[in-house]
C-alpha cells in the first residue's frame, strides 16, 4: 500500500504556499487524475510527487494515489484544504445530474475546516430548500441530497457563516431524472375498423410517458403519415397524440395501420387493421351443422356468427314450425358482440319437447339488407313398440308396429316358456326384419315401420317378441299364445 | 369542401413588415400541418416552412430563419405568415398549401402577392 | 439541401403527341423503410395555384385524367402526358418531399402549337 508525505489524513495551508505531496510506494505509483494545470509532476524513482508553489482555494480537495502493480489494489488519499477567507467554498461541477431516487452529490468542498459548523444548502438566491428535502454535509466531498426526487432538480448554493454573514458558493444545477421504466405506454383506437369508401374515418394514436423526451408516430403499412401531433400533461404524464381523419375513404386508405413511440428505453408498437369495403355487408354463418338431431328432453344451443357492416338494425330468433305458433322466449336468446364488427347470437333450448322440433331461423338486417340462417331441428326418440295377432289372407299373423327416429330396425325372437321378455337363454329362434315397412315418414316427426311374422300355428309353451332399436333406445313387446286366443304385452318398465 | 382562403394583395415599404393569413375550412384544422411557399419569377417556387396548428411549433427553411415567421390560431382555423425587414426580394405571391399525410401538398390557397416598393 | 433539376426548361408540342418531361435529385428520394420514392409532380396553369397530379413518383392524384403517367425512381425521375391536349397548358414542377426542406424543380413550361 502506497503512503503520502506528509501523512495527513488531511492538510491545512493558506493561498500563495507552496505545497508538496509525496506518494511513496514498492513499486510505481500514480496519482488519480485528473491533476490541475496549477501543479508540478515528477516521478522521483519509486516516488510520485506534485507540488504546487502558489496554492489557492481551487486546490481544495482529496489527492489519492495507488499503486497499479499492488495485487490488493490498495491507495493512500490526503484532503487538501487551502483556506481562503474570501473563498470559503471549490466547487467541483456546475451541473450534477442523478436519476430519481439516487444520492446527488453537489461537490462544493470547504476550503477551511473550521467552518464546517456552520454550513448549510440553499437554492440559489438564498432561497429555501423545498419541504422534505432530506441532505447531508461532508466537509471531503460537499452536500448530498438523499434519494433525490423530479422536483429538487433546482439551482443550488452552498452556504457558510464566516465572521457572523453567509457567504455562498456559486450555484450548481442539478438535474433529477425520471428512472424510465420503458417504452412509452401505446393506445391504439380502434382495434379494427371498417369503413364503405367515401365515408369518414378517425384513427387516433397515442403515447404517454414519463418524461417529455419520446417519440411518436403512425404509420400505414410502412409508411410515416405526416400527422401534427397534440401534446398534453396529466396524470403525471406527457401525452402525445397523433389523429388521422380521412374525409372519404378510398380503398388505398386500407391497410395495417400501427402506432410507434420510443424513448432511450426502446420502442413500442401496436397495430390494427382498417377495411374499405364498396357496399354494406352482412353475413351470417354458424359453426354447427344447419341440421340439427337431439334427443328428446335434452337441451341445445343453436349459435350463429354475424359479420356486419354498418351495425345492425334488428334481429331475431323466428319458429318456423311445423307444430305450433309458438315463439322462442326472448329470454332464451343471448347476443354477444366479440368486437366492433362481429357478434354471435345463441339461442338456448332447454328440455326439448315433441312440439320444439322443427325449423328455426336468425334473422339480421343492416343497410345492406336482410339475411337469415335456419336451422332444421328434428328430435330423436326411443322405439315405441306394440305387437297384434291378425289374419292376413286367412293365415295367422303377428304385427308389430315400432315408432321412433332415428328409423328404428326390427328383430322377432321366440323363446321357450311365458316371460315378458326373453333373455338369451331362453331364445330357440331369431328373426332380423331387414327391410320393414314404413308406415309414416313424415319430417320433424317419428318414423313408424311394420313387421310381420306368419306362423301357421303359434306353440302354446312359447313367447314370440318383437324388438325394435335404433341409436337412441330400444323397446320390446311380448306375444304369449293362450288355448282361448292369444295375449300381448309389453315388458315391465 | 376543402378550402384554403388567402388574404389580399398587399404593397408595402422596404424596411416594412407584412402579415398575411389562410383561412382553412371544410377540414380539422388541427389534422394537418400547414405549409407556405414563395413563388417568384426569378426562383420558381420555394418552401418557406411548416407550422404544427396543435403545438404552433414550426420547421424553417434555414434560408427564411429570421425572415419568415409563422403562426396559427386556432379557434378560426386561421394560419398567419409574418415578413419583416422587406426588400425588393421579398416581392412574390405567397401561398399557404396543406400537407397531407402522404407527403404531398394537397390543397392550395390561391396566393397573396406581396409587393415591397418605395 | 437536395437540388432538382427539370428539362427541358419548356417546349411546344401538337395536340395528340405524346410528352415527357424529367427531372433529377441530387440525391436518392428512395426511402428505405416503406420503398417509396418522395416525389411530387404538380401542374399550374397560368394564373392559378399549383395542382397535385401525381405523389410517391407514380400515384395519380384522385381525379387526374389517365394520360397523365409519372415514373422513376432514385434520382430520375419522369412525368409523361400520352396524348397532349389544349387544356394541359401548364407549367409542371416535381418537388421532394423526401427532407426538409422541401424542394421544387425550377419547371417545365408546356406550350400547345
Known amino acids: 500500500i502506497p503512503v503520502i508525505e506528509p501523512s495527513g489524513p488531511e492538510l491545512v495551508v493558506k493561498p500563495g504556499e507552496t505545497v508538496t505531496l509525496r506518494c511513496v510506494g514498492n513499486g510505481s505509483v500514480e496519482w488519480d487524475g485528473p491533476i490541475s494545470p496549477h501543479w508540478t509532476l515528477y516521478s522521483d524513482g519509486p516516488s510520485s510527487v506534485l507540488t504546487t508553489n502558489n496554492a489557492t482555494f481551487q486546490n481544495t480537495r482529496t489527492y489519492r494515489c495507488t499503486e497499479p502493480g499492488d495485487p490488493l489494489g490498495g491507495s493512500a488519499a490526503i484532503h487538501l484544504y487551502v483556506k481562503d477567507p474570501a473563498r470559503p467554498w471549490n466547487v467541483l461541477a456546475k451541473e450534477v445530474v442523478v436519476f430519481e431516487d439516487q444520492d446527488a452529490l453537489l461537490p462544493c468542498l470547504l476550503t477551511d475546516p473550521v467552518l464546517e459548523a456552520g454550513v448549510s444548502l440553499v437554492r440559489l438566491r438564498g432561497r429555501p430548500l423545498l419541504r422534505h428535502t432530506n441532505y447531508s454535509f461532508s466537509p471531503w466531498h460537499g452536500f448530498i441530497i438523499h434519494r433525490a426526487k423530479f422536483i429538487q432538480g433546482q439551482d443550488y448554493q452552498c452556504s457558510a457563516l464566516m465572521g457572523g454573514r453567509k457567504v455562498m458558493s456559486i450555484s450548481i444545477r442539478l438535474k433529477v431524472q425520471k428512472v424510465i421504466p420503458g417504452p412509452p405506454a401505446l393506445t391504439l383506437v380502434p382495434a379494427e375498423l371498417v369503413r364503405i369508401r367515401g365515408e369518414a374515418a378517425q384513427i387516433v394514436c397515442s403515447a404517454s410517458n414519463i418524461d417529455v423526451d419520446f417519440d411518436v408516430f403512425l404509420q400505414h403499412n410502412t409508411t410515416k403519415l405526416a400527422i401534427p401531433q397534440r401534446s398534453d400533461f396529466h396524470d403525471n404524464r406527457y401525452q402525445k397524440v397523433l389523429t388521422l381523419s380521412l374525409g372519404q375513404v378510398d380503398f388505398q386508405h386500407a391497410g395495417n395501420y400501427s402506432c410507434v413511440a420510443s424513448n432511450v428505453q426502446g420502442k413500442h408498437s401496436t397495430s390494427m387493421f382498417f377495411q374499405v369495403v364498396e357496399s354494406a355487408y352482412l353475413d351470417l354463418s354458424s359453426e354447427q351443422n344447419l341440421i340439427q338431431e337431439v334427443t328428446v328432453g335434452e337441451g341445445l344451443n343453436l349459435k350463429v356468427m354475424v359479420e356486419a357492416y354498418p351495425g345492425l338494425q334488428g334481429f331475431n330468433w323466428t319458429y318456423l314450425g311445423p307444430f305450433s305458433d309458438h315463439q322462442p322466449e326472448p329470454k332464451l336468446a343471448n347476443a354477444t358482440t366479440k368486437d366492433t364488427y362481429r357478434h354471435t347470437f345463441t339461442l338456448s333450448l332447454p328440455r326439448l319437447k315433441p312440439s320444439e322440433a322443427g325449423r328455426y331461423s336468425f334473422l339480421a338486417r343492416n343497410p345492406g339488407g336482410w339475411r337469415a340462417l335456419t336451422f332444421e331441428l328434428t328430435l330423436r326418440y326411443p322405439p315405441e313398440v306394440s305387437v297384434i295377432w291378425t289374419s292376413i289372407n286367412g293365415s295367422g299373423t303377428l304385427l308389430c308396429a315400432a315408432s321412433g327416429y332415428p328409423q328404428p330396425n326390427v328383430t322377432w325372437l321366440q323363446c321357450a316358456g311365458h316371460t315378458d321378455r326373453c333373455d338369451e337363454a331362453q331364445v330357440l329362434q331369431v328373426w332380423v326384419d331387414p327391410h320393414p315397412e314404413v308406415l309414416s315418414q313424415e319430417p320433424f316427426q317419428k318414423v313408424t315401420v311394420q313387421s310381420l311374422l306368419t306362423a301357421e300355428t303359434l306353440e302354446h309353451n312359447q313367447t314370440y317378441e318383437c324388438r325394435a332399436h335404433n341409436s337412441v333406445g330400444s323397446g320390446s313387446w311380448a306375444f304369449i299364445p293362450i288355448s282361448a286366443g292369444a295375449r300381448t304385452h309389453p315388458p315391465d318398465e | 369542401e376543402v378550402r384554403l382562403q388567402q388574404s389580399g394583395p398587399e404593397l408595402v415599404k422596404p424596411g416594412a413588415s407584412v402579415k398575411i393569413s389562410c383561412k382553412a375550412s371544410?377540414?380539422?384544422?388541427?389534422?394537418?400541418?400547414m405549409h407556405w411557399v414563395k413563388q417568384s419569377p426569378e426562383k420558381s417556387l420555394e418552401w418557406i416552412g411548416e407550422?404544427?396548428?396543435?403545438?404552433?411549433?414550426?420547421t424553417y427553411n434555414q434560408k427564411f430563419t429570421g425572415k419568415a415567421t409563422l403562426t396559427v390560431d386556432k379557434s378560426s382555423s386561421t394560419a398567419y405568415m409574418q415578413l419583416t425587414s422587406l426588400t425588393s426580394e421579398d416581392s412574390a405571391v405567397y401561398y399557404c398549401?396543406?400537407?397531407?399525410?402522404?407527403?404531398?401538398?394537397?390543397?392550395w390557397g390561391a396566393g397573396t402577392t406581396v409587393t415591397v416598393s418605395s | 439541401d437536395i437540388v432538382m433539376t427539370q428539362s427541358p426548361s419548356s417546349l411546344a408540342m401538337s395536340v395528340g403527341q405524346k410528352v415527357t418531361m424529367s427531372c433529377k435529385s441530387s440525391?436518392?428520394?428512395?426511402?428505405?423503410?416503406?420503398?417509396?420514392?418522395?416525389l411530387a409532380w404538380y401542374q399550374q396553369k397560368p394564373g392559378q395555384s399549383p395542382k397535385l397530379l401525381v405523389y410517391?413518383?407514380?400515384t395519380r392524384d384522385s381525379g387526374v385524367p389517365d394520360r397523365f403517367t409519372g415514373s422513376g425512381s432514385g434520382t430520375d425521375f419522369t412525368l409523361t402526358i400520352t396524348s397532349v391536349q389544349t387544356e394541359d397548358l401548364a407549367v409542371y414542377y416535381c418537388?421532394?418531399?423526401?427532407?426538409?426542406?422541401?424542394?421544387f424543380g425550377s419547371g417545365t413550361k408546356l406550350e400547345i402549337q
Open positions: 398549401a396543406r400537407l397531407n399525410y402522404y407527403w404531398y401538398f394537397d390543397v
Open positions: 371544410g377540414y380539422t384544422f388541427t389534422g394537418y400541418y
Open positions: 407550422i404544427n396548428p396543435n403545438t404552433g411549433s414550426c
Open positions: 440525391q436518392t428520394l428512395l426511402n428505405s423503410n416503406d420503398q417509396k420514392n418522395y
Open positions: 410517391f413518383a407514380s
Open positions: 418537388q421532394q418531399d423526401y427532407s426538409t426542406p422541401f424542394t
